[in-house]
């Protein structure tokens, strides 16, 4: 992967009102199941079509839940995070960090006709062009000198 | 209303083959991690395989090799395709989803599922 990839880290409030089949979305993570290395934290990975979380629209694939009605979720087993949200009750407040990538450099591969991802044969080869053309001009101005 | 039904049971004998399935009804299957388990008589209910919303799989050692769990997301159905059945297979077979959990382990290794079917038998003599 060529170039760095940071984050820019928000967090917010999301109060969900219980479906017929929970809160709309899957969790992974735990101290027994860590999604993210170093990192025991309770991800979301599933927003189910048409759950709560789905109509409400602001949770995202890829969120870390910190808390569940005030409840910390650091240092939990998968099971027992699990069972916090299988008890939380009919509404629901969670408190989420959302991660949106920014891109520093060229990362991996982009489509053809991104105008952010630009070759970079096509910015260094100008340039070395440029460079040629003023150093010769350069020489060419100290012979006449 | 979610609703989960189990077929395909019944009597085989030992080195035969059986598949069940189970058809899901109320919700779509492939948002949910769910898994096969069984209960023989006198015995606690253990997980048997299990399969995440993202497709990853788990299976319990004693069906290691034997078993296969899959999904149909057209047909919404999940399914245990069982070979080289031994007669210690004999159990009540349930499907169960939870609602939260994502990790195929996990709900292999837990009882606190949110969603159960009612079973079929599964005989190994």
């Known amino acids: 992967m060529n170039g760095r990839v940071d984050y820019l880290v928000t967090e917010e409030e999301i109060n969900l009102t219980r479906g017929p089949s929970g809160l709309g979305f899957n969790i992974v993570g735990g101290t027994d199941q860590q999604y993210v290395s170093n990192d025991s934290g309770i991800y979301v990975s599933r927003i189910k079509e048409n759950g709560a979380a789905a109509l409400d629209g602001r949770l995202q694939e890829g969120d870390k839940i910190l808390s569940v009605n005030g409840q910390d979720l650091k240092n939990l087993l998968h099971q027992d995070a699990v069972d916090l949200f299988r008890n939380a009750g009919y509404a629901v407040s969670l408190r989420v960090q959302h991660r949106l990538q920014v891109q520093n450099g060229p990362i991996g591969h982009r489509g053809e006709g991104d105008p952010s991802g630009i070759p970079i044969f096509m910015v260094l080869v100008p340039v070395f062009a440029l460079t040629m053309v003023a150093a010769w001009a350069f020489m060419r101005y100290r012979q006449q000198l | 209303q979610v609703q989960l039904v189990e077929s395909g049971g019944g009597l085989v004998q030992p080195g035969g083959s059986l598949r069940l399935s189970c058809a899901a009804s109320?919700?779509?299957?492939?948002?949910?991690?769910i898994g096969w388990f069984r209960q023989a008589p006198g015995k606690e209910r253990e997980g048997v395989s299990c399969?995440?919303?993202?497709?990853?799989?788990y299976y319990a050692d004693s069906v290691k090799g034997r078993f296969t769990i899959s999904r149909d997301n057209v047909k919404n159905t999940l399914y245990l395709q069982m070979n080289s059945l031994k007669p210690e297979d004999t159990a009540l077979y349930y499907c169960?989803?939870?609602?939260?959990?994502?990790?195929?382990?996990?709900?292999?290794?837990?009882?606190?599922?949110?969603?159960w079917g009612q079973g079929t038998q599964v005989t190994v003599s």
């Open positions: 169960a989803a939870s609602y939260y959990s994502d990790y195929e382990v996990a709900v292999c290794r837990s009882d606190a599922l949110d969603a």
């Open positions: 399969i995440s919303s993202h497709g990853s799989t």
């Open positions: 109320g919700f779509t299957l492939d948002d949910y991690a």
